[in-house]
Interface confidence: low
Amino acid sequence: HSDPARRGELSVCDSISEWVTAADKKTAVDMSGGTVTVLEKVPVSKGQLKQYFYETKCNPMGYTKEGCRGIDKRHWNSQCRTTQSYVRALTMDSKKRIGWRFIRIDTSCVCTLTIKRGR
Amino acid sequence: HSDPARRGELSVCDSISEWVTAADKKTAVDMSGGTVTVLEKVPVSKGQLKQYFYETKCNPMGYTKEGCRGIDKRHWNSQCRTTQSYVRALTMDSKKRIGWRFIRIDTSCVCTLTIKRGR
């Protein structure tokens, strides 16, 4: 593909990514919408593994906090929005049942549009 | 989170999401850049769990395959691009060593811009 320096690529929405430990997270929302506790460690064959997640969200300090970059403002209002995905995690529910559940985590920052009325 | 379509919102890039099993995936790229085999099942205290992932990518059949929606075309070229993140998976490397590794999976479809030259 062509040379990216000549392409001078920019993101429509600025995001930040970080590793988040279960200790930082503490709780999460599972696929049924319930709040579960994220366990700090996962038992594996040779002991325990620290449970952590790679999360990406919209950058609150970024240029795009007021709206998306590069949008046709005559026709559209825009907003950068953090989107979520599901990852499996060892969790405990409100009834103290421990199990592997899919939980929601922040994975991206995307641009959403609404059409401008009354033009 | 609430459905953006209900709010009369449109995404700048159309995406599709699906559950992908380890059997479908077969291999993945780990954090060191190596190709690893994704194991179909994970041993848990009460037997085995099928290993699968929630993946999101740009919709190749969508309206936005030619460029992002809502962009100011006088000033910008645009492209919808699948982005990746890391999730932990039980994998086997080329030396047949089994272990939990972070692998890359598709998690979003975002819009990237390049400025139009020669205006």
Epitope: S17 | M31, S32, V110
Partner: antibody
């Protein structure tokens, strides 16, 4: 040994442009945040720009270069770039590329040897 | 922007002596602080990250301490190869990543 090798420096007139390249070897370049850092003659280190690994095009700039410099990367070529436009005398410095981590919350653990940019008429 | 301030600007020390370099952040940076060594004509080299973790291959005479806003790099017994410029850098809140102004450790 993990290496970064910068090129593209030189003498340029004020208002001119220059493109720096940084070739990476021996590590999985596409996994890491990368940054450019500069050092003016006899001065300290100044971070210039940074870029994400994941294809989202996320780029970050120091206020002093915003709108004039563009950081980009080509993972297929293991190469980082810095396109510098509208150069000023105060941009004169040694420019280093540096590898960070999988996120930007990491120090710069590998540095290139630097390439010198001189902006003068 | 987080401002990093290093002191002293120059430190004159005899070989074998202890050197203590300070770095102060204008607001908390947690433990997201790194120390770099730079010799004339060379690129910086990472010594310490996470405020106190030594990089593999760095001699144990180098140690880092502190958290929040106050940090210290200590060189317990200066060797001839340790005379150089030292920079602290925060990577807690960016952009921008910010460096201190540097401390030059010179032979007394």
């Amino acid at each position: 040994e993990v290496q970064l090798l910068e090129s593209g420096g030189g003498l340029v007139q004020p208002g001119g442009s220059l493109r720096l390249s940084c070739a990476a070897s021996v590590f999985t370049f596409s996994n890491y945040y990368m940054s450019w850092v500069r050092q003016a003659p006899g001065k300290g280190l100044e971070w210039v720009a940074g870029i994400n690994w994941n294809g989202a095009g996320d780029t970050y700039y120091a206020d002093s270069v915003k709108g004039r410099f563009t950081i980009s990367r080509d993972n297929s070529k293991n190469t980082l770039y810095l396109q510098m436009n509208s150069l000023r005398a105060e941009d004169t410095a040694v420019y280093y590329c540096a590898k960070q981590g999988v996120t930007h919350y990491n120090p710069m653990d590998v540095w290139g040897q630097g390439t010198t940019v001189t902006v003068s008429s | 922007e987080i401002v990093m301030t290093q002191s002293p600007a120059t430190l004159s020390v005899s070989p074998g002596d202890r050197a203590t370099l300070s770095c102060r952040a204008s607001q908390t940076v947690g433990s997201k602080l790194a120390w770099y060594q730079q010799k004339p004509g060379q690129a910086p080299r990472l010594l310490i990250y996470g405020a106190r973790t030594r990089v593999a291959g760095i001699p144990d005479r180098f140690s880092g301490s502190g958290s929040g806003t106050e940090f210290t790099l200590t060189i317990s017994s200066l060797q001839s190869e340790d005379f150089a410029e030292y920079y602290c850098q925060q990577y807690y809140d960016w952009p921008p990543l910010t460096f201190g102004g540097g401390t030059k450790v010179e032979i007394k």
